[in-house]
Interface confidence: low
């Protein structure tokens, strides 16, 4: 960012999307602003219109190509600018030389499904979405389970320190409704952060068999 009151943060999803948020105190109202992406070694450039997400912050997604296309590599640098229109001119409001594989945030895992459920345990699988083949197996996951009467924030985090796209939840209560979420993070990148949480998967454990101890 160009001054202390402005913050310009972007993340690469490892394939063909750069998501950006720009916030600025006292930013001009009713001004058209956009993010412009200018790679150092590619023939393309791309823009997206910044749309308000709060009183003083705007966001947009730079769509670089087909969702699963590998548009950038570990050696690319992309100059990202926030440009705001002032009359007939475009004024540069913020700028960064963006190293995509140092600023990763993957898409949330998808296709969560219950593989097998019992009275006290449940096996759940998922898939990662639009993740670069460069990572090979260098990914980690966090998962959490929402129990009745609790909030997501209270749910303990389960860490999977390898590319393991399933989990076996144990010590569950029979005949109880639960929800499950998972998120993913590459091991690479100084400023890399966790993906958003997946959509919650609701499941119910099987009731205990009549006449049996639980």
């Amino acid at each position: 960012a160009v001054n202390g009151t402005s913050q310009f943060t972007c993340f690469y999803n490892s394939r063909a999307n750069i998501s950006c948020v720009w916030s600025q105190d006292g930013a001009l109202q009713d001004t058209s602003c956009q993010v412009h992406a200018w790679p150092d070694r590619r023939r393309w450039n791309q823009t997206c219109e910044l749309l308000p997400v709060s009183q003083a912050s705007w966001a947009c997604n730079l769509i670089l190509g087909a969702p699963d296309s590998q548009k950038l590599t570990t050696v690319d640098i992309v100059t990202l600018r926030v440009l705001c229109r002032e009359g007939v001119r475009w004024r540069v409001m913020a700028i960064q030389d963006f190293k995509p594989f140092e600023n990763l945030r993957l898409m949330a895992p998808i296709s969560l499904q219950v593989v097998h459920v019992e009275t006290h345990r449940c096996n759940i699988s998922w898939e990662i979405s639009q993740a670069s083949h460069y990572f090979e197996r260098h990914l980690e996951f966090e998962a959490r389970t929402l129990s009745p009467g609790h909030t997501w924030e209270e749910a303990p985090l389960l860490t999977l320190k390898q590319k393991q796209e399933w989990i076996c939840l144990e010590t569950l209560t029979p005949d109880t409704q639960y929800e499950f979420q998972v998120r993913v993070k590459p091991l690479q990148g100084e400023f890399t952060t966790w993906s958003p949480w997946s959509q919650p998967l609701a499941f119910r454990t099987k009731p205990a068999a009549l006449g049996k101890d639980t």
Partner: nanobody
Framework: QVQLVESGGGLVQPGGSLRLSCAAS????????MAWFRQAPGKEREFVAS????????DYVDSVKGRFTVSRDNAKNTVYLQMNNLKPEDTAVYYC????????????????WGQGTQVTVSS
């Protein structure tokens, strides 16, 4: 609005070198794409070289390619023009220019200008 002050001009023999500097003040320097122009006696002001706000991308007029190098130091709010293998036809007043619209930096009417510094190449 940014203010620009050039320095480093002078008299130099053909084949010699000079380094021009342009110090900026009054606004956030990194917002500006910077350029050097020159104007020889009786001729129109012409584009010489430009450097984008990040300093990563440069552009030159064909006649100076391989001889001149434009650069900037955003920490010092300064842009430079290193001129090597100078020729008599490089004699001109050299102007520093700034524009927040990097698509318009070659446009004479939309830039902010310094006062210029004289470069004379003569034996």
């Amino acid at each position: 609005q940014v203010q620009l002050v050039e320095s480093g001009g002078g008299l130099v023999q053909p084949g010699g070198s000079l380094r021009l500097s342009c110090a900026a003040s009054g606004d956030v320097f990194v917002r500006y794409t910077m350029a050097w122009f020159r104007q020889a006696p009786g001729k129109e002001r012409e584009f010489v070289a430009s450097v984008t706000d990040s300093g990563r991308t440069t552009d030159y007029v064909d006649s100076v390619k391989g001889r001149f190098t434009v650069s900037r130091d955003n920490a010092k709010n300064t842009v430079y023009l290193q001129m090597n293998n100078l020729k008599p036809e490089d004699t001109a007043v050299y102007y520093c220019a700034a524009n927040t619209d990097y698509f318009q930096i070659k446009s004479l009417d939309r830039n902010t200008w310094g006062q210029g510094t004289q470069v004379t190449v003569s034996s």
